[in-house]
């Protein structure tokens, strides 16, 4: 059942971690793996790394794109490698932004 | 079964450098992390650093970032650790190791390398 | 970086018998994911450590019930019932938590 409380021994995945929280490492173990993508100063900011906190994950992964931001998440060793969030789009694109990938 | 294959002993002069390989099998190379691990004669055990074959990406141990070079080489599924300078300090034996997933830490040993430094 | 203090440096069993082994760490291994990354390995003479509990109590796949960890934040023990021949050799912990990983300085289980 999606509500579930989760199990004491919460099964814990490796995931990719691209970002400022990443410090100098490029992977991250949680329960959760994510891809986000949100708009900050007219830049695209892609981040990927982990939700640590079962409650965490569960609150941000349940929310709805928006035009500002958008994380997938997922469940599985290095599930994000190949994931990239996608903003929502109503056939046109957002003027005078810039991708950029937070590293 | 998984496996971790290292290179055979050496015996090296001060001064020069080493190359020892750590060859995988029985699992998908890209997906675990390879830490690399020093055991001096009768001594406990000291962790170096790792590199992660899928990106490359390595993270040392500040007390080996001078001495060691961790490499990969995917097509292969082989890990490399180049020591450079070496001293009587540094006669050891270098364990490649697995980490394993859901937290389980080093799941998986080479047999080690027996690296004796001597003129 | 965190030091590991493991005691004893030798332990003498006597086979069928108990032992006890503790390590404690300079500063709490508790993760930022609430995880704590405190292992034990066994290293048999002569060959390479093999890893017996992970992330303090969990025993790795194949290591028997006689293997049992404990403990939270600075301080862990393990336990072992019941001691075997094959169960001789140097014991360390490690722990992953922070960077760099640092091994206990061992302990060396013996027949009495």
């Known amino acids: 059942v999606e509500d579930e409380k989760p199990k004491v021994n919460q099964k814990l995945y490796m995931c990719v971690c691209e970002g400022l929280s990443c410090g100098n490492e490029d992977h991250c173990e949680g329960q959760q793996c994510f891809s986000s993508l949100s708009i900050n100063d007219g830049f695209h900011v892609y981040q990927k790394g982990c939700f640590q906190v079962y409650e965490q994950g569960k609150m941000t992964c349940k929310t709805p794109p928006s035009p500002g931001q958008a994380v997938e998440c997922c469940q599985g060793d290095w599930c994000n490698r190949n994931i990239t969030a996608q903003l929502p789009t109503k056939g046109k694109s957002f003027p005078g932004t810039q991708n950029f990938h937070l590293e | 079964q998984v496996k971790l294959l290292q290179s055979g002993a050496a015996l090296v002069k001060p001064g020069d450098s080493i190359r020892m390989s750590c060859k995988a099998s029985g699992y998908t190379f890209t997906d675990y992390i390879i830490h690399w691990v020093k055991q001096s004669h009768g001594k406990s055990l000291e962790w170096i650093g790792y590199?992660?074959?899928?990106?490359?990406?390595?993270n040392y141990n500040e007390k080996f970032k001078s001495k060691a070079t961790l490499t990969v080489d995917k097509s292969s599924s082989t890990a490399y650790m180049e020591f450079c300078r070496l001293t009587s300090e540094d006669s050891a034996i270098y364990y490649c190791v697995r980490r394993g997933h859901d937290g389980t830490g080093f799941d998986y040993w080479g047999q080690g390398v027996m690296v004796t430094v001597s003129s | 970086d965190v030091v590991m203090t493991q005691t004893p440096v030798s332990l003498p069993v006597s086979l069928g018998g108990q032992a006890s082994i503790s390590c404690r760490s300079s500063q709490s291994l508790v993760h930022s994911n609430g995880e704590t990354y405190l292992h034990w390995y066994l290293q048999k003479p002569g060959q390479s450590p093999q890893l017996l509990i992970y992330?303090?109590?969990n025993r790795f796949s194949g290591v028997p019930d006689r293997f049992s960890g404990s403990g939270s934040g600075t301080d862990f023990t393990l336990k072992l019932s019941r001691v075997e021949p094959e169960d001789l050799g140097d014991y360390y912990c490690l722990q992953s938590t922070h960077l760099p990983l640092t091994f206990g300085s061992g302990t060396k289980l013996e027949i009495k």
């Open positions: 992330r303090v109590s």
């Open positions: 590199i992660n074959p899928y990106s490359g990406g390595t």
